[in-house]
Interface confidence: low
């Protein structure tokens, strides 16, 4: 094996076509040098992935009750920088870097309870705005998915996580505007809301509506309202969800994790930091032999597809041995 | 053999301050999440706070945010809990514990928050 | 809610199998780990991320966490297993918040 030195703060493998790791991957409870050599005569328990249960472990080379992956590395187990195209938020959801969070339509008519209900169950909560650009960022999305767009032309209003609270009924109606969940303090409220059409007499709450006006030519206006509505009555809504970690495949992962982020190579491995891949290493593939012209698979860490006109369509670039 | 070696508990009054340390050795401390537990007389554990590796991150149980801050000096191996406006319910053994899950815990210092 | 419940006590003779259980919410999402502490002393790690054991630990612990549930069970319990043990995992509600269930006094009848 050819001499070669690790960088400050990386871990030589004694063995194996792995040559250097991070150095807190030593001792960490998972081998991931091919001879186990980090695991070896370490004095302590090593670290457990911190709790979550979603995710592929990748320096395992095994999913969670899965089949080995084809996770096969050559040389140094490189660190990259990532950019912005990896993903932070699941398929269908808007990501905003200003809150780093994701938000979603749900075009489904609920009422405000159980559209609360169902944003909780994704993770999330109905949406509060902590800044004008936030709420602008918001307006801007085309929301629409192609198939449901009349549903969303018809029913242009959000439930989002405020209340109206009424305080007097004297010559009108007096309140003020709360945030319906407990969350984030830096919110801002809302101004004087438009009030629906009919409302009860008993209602001492009701709930937030804003409304989008998504015709293209007033789109770039902002333009849009807020309504207090009788928060049994039946809307599509928007949920609001801090930024995560995602993966190829589109699986949400948990802090601490290793995962291969969504973006355009599947030979990144990372850890998952508040919702950002950290300290992430991409392996090195051997080209495959005995083909000139080869495609990578755009899923599949150094699996090729071979575009000679009589070569083999599907090469792995390792060799047998080194599995 | 990790060794999380505590000082710092005492009797205090109510409103006062006090600060807890935990001194790490046998493991690459710098690598590691570390949290602080506490367990009321007869009571049983909870969850206090937790600060990551590098000491950017911190979290609070809801019952302390704002009175105690976490912290660390990786250069020592030592974790810290300031405990700040004290109130006759923080009285409790406090435990230091390394890492999420934690694996290896302090001994435990009592801290008595009496007038 | 973002709670784990325990049973506060459980008894089992000398060389049987207990299983002690923790439910949970956010134990659907997240791995669960197993203290046990005994009288004065600081709490003790027998399981993480559901089953595994850390070394030192005797192959008599075992995990596991099904749906809203996780179990510790002791197979051939032996005297010095009397203590309470306690659940913990993250909560759902507070991703780095962390979450311990009331415990579970286990009592070892000769």
């Known amino acids: 094996r050819p001499e070669l030195r690790c960088n400050p703060g990386q871990f030589a493998c004694h063995g194996g076509t792995i040559q250097c790791i991070p150095l807190p991957w030593q001792c960490d409870g998972w081998p991931t040098c091919e001879d186990k050599s980090d695991e070896a005569d370490c004095p302590v328990t090593g670290e457990a992935r911190p709790y979550g249960k979603e995710t592929v472990d990748l320096r395992q080379g095994r999913a969670r009750g899965g089949d080995p992956t084809h996770f096969h590395t050559v040389n140094v187990a490189q660190p990259v920088r990532f950019s912005s195209f990896l993903g932070k938020c699941p398929s269908g959801w808007h990501h905003y870097e200003g809150t780093a969070s994701c938000y979603r339509v749900y075009l489904s008519g609920e009422n405000y309870w159980d559209a609360a209900q169902t944003c909780q169950r994704v993770n999330g909560s109905l949406a509060t705005f902590s800044t004008d650009q936030e709420l602008r960022f918001v307006l801007a999305q085309e929301w629409d998915q192609p198939e449901r767009s009349f549903g969303w032309k018809d029913q242009r209003k959000l439930w989002v996580g405020y209340q109206y609270v009424i305080t007097g009924r004297n010559h009108s109606l007096e309140g003020r505007w709360e945030v319906a969940f407990k969350g984030s303090p830096e919110v801002f409220l809302p101004p004087d809301p438009i009030f629906a059409s009919a409302m009860s007499e008993n209602d001492n709450v009701f709930c937030a509506q804003l409304q989008c006006f998504h015709f293209p030519t007033l789109r770039h206006h902002d333009l849009h309202s807020w309504h207090a509505e009788s928060c049994s009555e039946k809307s599509s809504f928007l949920c609001k969800r801090s930024q995560t970690c995602v993966d190829i495949k589109d699986n949400v992962v948990d802090e601490g994790f290793y995962f291969t982020p969504k973006g355009d190579d599947p030979c990144l491995s990372c850890t998952c930091h508040r919702g950002e891949p950290e300290m992430c290493v991409a392996a090195l593939c051997e080209r495959p032999q005995g083909c000139q012209q080869y495609r990578k698979d755009p899923k599949e860490c150094c699996k090729f597809m071979c575009l000679d006109p009589d070569g083999s369509s599907l090469f792995d670039s390792m060799a047998s041995g080194m599995r | 053999e990790v060794q999380l070696q505590q000082s710092g508990g005492g009797l205090v009054q109510p409103g006062g301050s006090l600060r807890l340390s935990c001194a790490a050795s046998e493991f690459p401390f710098s690598s590691y999440a570390m949290s602080w537990v506490r367990q009321a007389p007869g009571k049983g554990l909870a969850w206090v706070s937790a600060?990551?590796?590098?000491?950017?991150?911190?979290y609070y149980a809801d019952s302390v945010k704002g009175r105690f801050t976490i912290s660390r000096d990786n250069s020592k191996n030592t974790l810290y809990l300031q405990m700040n406006s004290l109130r006759a319910e923080d009285t409790a053994v406090y435990y230091c514990a390394k890492n999420w899950n934690l694996d290896y815990w302090g001994q435990g210092t009592l801290v008595t928050v009496s007038s | 809610s973002s709670e784990l419940t325990q049973d506060p006590a459980v008894s089992v003779a000398l060389g049987q199998t207990v299983m002690i259980t923790c439910q949970g919410h956010s134990l659907r999402s997240y791995y669960a780990s197993w203290y046990q502490q005994k009288p004065g002393q600081a709490p003790l790690l027998v399981i993480y991320?559901?089953?595994r054991r850390p070394s030192g630990i005797p192959d008599r612990f075992s995990g596991s966490n099904s749906g809203n549930t996780a179990s510790l069970t002791i197979t051939g319990t032996q005297a010095e297993d009397e203590a309470d043990y306690y659940c913990?995992?993250?909560?759902?509600?507070?991703?780095?918040?962390?979450?311990f269930g009331g415990g579970t006094k286990l009592t070892v009848l000769s």
């Open positions: 600060i990551s590796s590098s000491g950017g991150d911190t």
């Open positions: 913990n995992s993250r909560d759902s509600s507070g991703h780095h918040n962390v979450l």
């Open positions: 991320g559901d089953n």
